[in-house]
C-alpha cells in the first residue's frame, strides 16, 4: 500500500467543535516523498470550494508526516463551515474530504456547550 | 504490519459495566477512525459507533446512544469502548476496527479478532 | 437508518462455479462528494470479518481478481467468477454513506 504518491489525510465527515474568540489551528496532514507539494485551503460554499487567499498559513513537520496549517487568529463566526485542503503534485489536483468547523458564539451562549452537545449537531 | 489486539472474552455480571479495550500496532491510531461492531450469536453485525482519536470526536449510532461510550489513548494507542447497564441482550462478540484515510476515499481497514462478552449471573 | 437488502440468505455453488449476491440499500448511497461509500466483507467461519472490496468496486489489497463489485445509487452486487473452497463463509454489504453506517443481514456462501 505504501507509494510515492501525495495523500492528504484529512478524515471524512471529521468535526471540530470550536468557540469564536479562541485561536485555532486547522490541520492538513500530507504525506511526500521527495518534494513537498504546493498546498492551499479552500472553504465550502455549497459545491463550490473558494480558495482562501491571504491567510496565515505555516508547516509544521512530525516524523513522516507533514501537517499544512490554517491558522485563526482569532475563531470567528463566519469561520463556521467546512473545509478542503488541496495539493499540487506533478500538476495533478488532490483534495482531501472536508472538514467541518462547528463554531459557537460564545456572546450567543450562556456557558460553553459539552463535546456531547457539539456532536450531537 | 498493523494489527488489532483485543481481550479474547469477558464474563460480566448483568446491571454491571464492562470497558473493552484494542490496542493497535504499526499504526498511529491518530490517523484513523477507530470503530465498533457488535455480532450476536448466529446473527449480523451492527455498527456501534466511531472515534477520532486526533481529537476524541465520537459518533454514535443512535441505538446504542447511552449504552457505549468510546474513548481513545493515543500514547498507548489504544481504543476503549465501555458498555453500562449490562443485559443478556449486550452479549456478543466485539470486534473493534480502524478505518486509514488516504486523498479523498477509503483506503483500508484493519478487524481486530473480537472480544466476547457475556453477561450472567 | 438506512436498510441495506441481501439477497440470497443462503447460497450453495459448485467449486468452479459463479456465485453472485444481490444488495439493494433503502436510499441511494452516493455521497455529496461524488463518491459511493458501499463495502463487501467477508467473515470465514470462526473468524472476524474482513473487508473485501470498498467504494462499490475497489479490491482491498491481496484480494483476488476473481472478486468483482458493480452498482450504482441503490443497486449493487458481488460476483465471483469462479468460486474456490476458501470463499466459504458469510458475505456481507456495508454503506458507510450515510449516519448511521449499515449493515446488510449477510448471505452465507456455501460449497456443494
Known amino acids: 500500500k505504501e507509494s510515492c504518491d501525495v495523500q492528504l489525510y484529512i478524515k471524512r465527515q471529521s468535526y471540530h467543535s470550536i468557540f469564536a474568540g479562541d485561536p485555532f489551528k486547522l490541520e492538513c496532514p500530507v504525506k511526500y516523498c521527495a518534494h513537498r507539494p504546493q498546498v492551499t485551503w479552500c472553504k465550502l460554499n455549497g459545491t463550490t470550494c473558494v480558495k482562501l487567499e491571504g491567510r496565515h498559513t505555516s508547516w509544521k513537520q512530525e516524523k513522516n508526516l507533514s501537517f499544512f496549517i490554517l491558522h485563526f487568529e482569532p475563531v470567528l463566526p463566519s469561520d463556521n463551515g467546512s473545509y478542503r485542503c488541496s495539493a499540487n503534485f506533478l500538476s495533478a489536483i488532490i483534495e482531501s474530504h472536508s472538514t467541518t468547523l462547528y463554531v459557537t458564539d460564545v456572546k450567543s451562549a450562556s456557558e460553553r456547550p459539552s463535546k456531547d452537545e457539539m456532536a450531537s449537531r | 504490519e498493523v494489527q488489532l489486539q483485543q481481550s479474547v472474552a469477558e464474563l460480566v455480571r448483568p446491571g454491571a459495566s464492562v470497558k473493552l479495550s484494542c490496542t493497535a500496532s504499526?499504526?498511529?491510531?491518530?490517523?484513523?477512525?477507530m470503530y465498533w461492531v457488535k455480532q450476536r450469536p448466529e446473527q449480523g453485525l451492527e455498527w456501534i459507533g466511531r472515534?477520532?482519536?486526533?481529537?476524541?470526536?465520537?459518533k454514535y449510532a443512535p441505538k446504542f446512544q447511552g449504552k457505549a461510550t468510546i474513548t481513545a489513548d493515543t500514547s498507548s494507542n489504544t481504543a476503549y469502548l465501555q458498555l453500562s447497564s449490562l443485559t443478556s441482550e449486550d452479549t456478543a462478540i466485539y470486534y473493534c476496527?480502524?478505518?486509514?484515510?488516504?486523498?479523498?476515499?477509503?483506503?483500508?481497514?484493519?478487524w481486530g479478532q473480537g472480544t466476547t462478552l457475556t453477561v450472567s449471573s | 437508518d438506512v436498510v441495506m437488502t441481501q439477497t440470497p440468505l443462503t447460497l450453495s455453488v459448485t467449486i468452479g462455479q459463479p456465485a453472485s449476491i444481490s444488495c439493494k440499500s433503502s436510499?441511494?448511497?452516493?455521497?455529496?462528494?461524488?463518491?459511493?461509500?458501499l463495502n463487501w466483507l467477508l467473515q470465514r467461519p470462526g473468524q472476524s470479518p474482513k473487508r473485501l472490496i470498498y467504494?462499490?468496486?475497489k479490491l482491498d489489497s491481496g484480494v483476488p481478481d476473481r472478486f468483482t463489485g458493480s452498482g450504482s445509487g441503490t443497486d449493487f452486487t458481488l460476483k465471483i467468477s469462479r468460486v474456490e473452497a476458501e470463499d466459504l463463509g458469510v458475505y456481507y454489504c456495508?454503506?458507510?454513506?450515510?449516519?448511521?453506517?449499515?449493515f446488510g443481514g449477510g448471505t452465507k456462501l456455501e460449497i456443494k
Open positions: 476496527a480502524l478505518l486509514y484515510y488516504g486523498s479523498s476515499y477509503d483506503y483500508f481497514d484493519y
Open positions: 504499526g499504526f498511529n491510531i491518530k490517523n484513523t477512525y
Open positions: 472515534i477520532d482519536p486526533a481529537n476524541g470526536n465520537t
Open positions: 436510499q441511494s448511497l452516493l455521497d455529496s462528494d461524488g463518491k459511493t461509500y
Open positions: 467504494l462499490v468496486s
Open positions: 456495508w454503506q458507510g454513506t450515510h449516519f448511521p453506517q449499515t
